[in-house]
């Protein structure tokens, strides 16, 4: 089976690497453009100089191109607690992270969200947190693990999961509950 | 208590358009950022759009990018999703939520109203 290819795909796959086919001249191939460049002017023939220019401020191209326009430099989201690590260039986008004790969820491919690492009060650190991924909480005895969180187990009801680790105190709340009986 | 109130989903054509509501009370709205998640039949939780207090970030799904606008009117405490060019994909229950704080989970969300793309 013959992998289908995209018409830009194919157009590139005629000419060797670092090569364009020019859109007009199926028989001419332009040098593409450097990254931190776009595609101003294909070239006039062959063994001619394709007609690159550099990204305005406020974009970028991180590879070797034949784009008509440079990237949008991306923005760190602050509603979702993103801080930029370093700023867009004409060769590199934006990269944006989360602060120091904090870890990203993504809520997507290409969205995530910072929240602060669990500190496992009431328990231990199994896994210490990670830059995509929140503290392992192991939790004490007398308490059961909630959403990340170490909850006493007398917050625990009978119908959550919770009832199997905090069986012996859910009884003793059920003992004092008969025994309060007159 | 805080409730959310989605409104404004039904049948539609593709191609077709509809506006969602969600009407917000029982904490400051206007100090929340919004966001529209939806479940199609079968599927998890998707991502479609957020936008934060005051209205001029917003955030659009790859899938949903150039036909879906999420805006809000923070007088009226409601959050809205005008949907165009809608297609069979976009069939799912639509939810609006609080942007989550303390950990990757929503603290409050509607019921949900169902939006179905069919011919």
């Known amino acids: 089976l013959v992998p289908h290819l995209g018409d830009r795909e194919k157009r590139d796959s005629v000419c060797p690497q670092g090569k364009y086919i020019h859109p007009q001249n199926n028989s001419i191939c332009c040098t593409k453009c450097h990254k931190g460049t776009y595609l101003y002017n294909d070239c006039p023939g062959p063994g001619q100089d394709t007609d690159c220019r550099e990204c305005e401020s406020g974009s970028f191209t991180a590879s070797e191109n034949h784009l008509r326009h440079c990237l949008s430099c991306s923005k760190c989201r602050k509603e979702m607690g993103q801080v930029e690590i370093s700023s867009c260039t004409v060769d590199r986008d934006t990269v944006c992270g989360c602060r120091k004790n904090q870890y990203r969820h993504y809520w997507s491919e290409n969205l995530f969200q910072c929240f602060n690492c669990s500190l496992c009060l009431n328990g231990t650190v199994h896994l210490s947190c990670q830059e995509k991924q929140n503290t392992v909480c192991t939790c004490h005895a007398g308490f059961f693990l909630r959403e990340n969180e170490c909850v006493s187990c007398s917050n625990c009801k009978k119908s959550l999961e919770c009832t199997k680790l905090c069986l012996p105190q859910i009884e003793n709340v059920k003992g004092t509950e008969d025994s309060g009986t007159t | 208590e805080v409730q959310l109130l989605e409104s404004g989903g039904g049948l539609v054509q593709p191609g077709g358009s509809l506006r969602l509501s969600c009407a917000a009370s029982g904490f400051t709205f206007a100090h929340e950022p919004m966001v529209w998640v939806r479940q199609a039949p079968g599927k998890g939780l998707e991502w479609v759009s957020h936008?934060?207090?005051?209205?001029?970030?917003?955030y659009y799904a790859d899938s949903v990018k150039g036909r879906f606008t999420i805006s809000r009117d923070n007088s009226k405490n409601t959050l809205y999703l005008q949907m165009n060019s809608l297609r069979a994909e976009d069939t799912a229950v639509y939810y609006c939520a609080g942007l989550p704080k303390r950990g990757p989970r929503f603290d409050y969300w509607g019921q949900g109203t169902l939006v179905t793309v069919s011919s």
């Open positions: 936008i934060d207090r005051v209205g001029q970030d917003t």
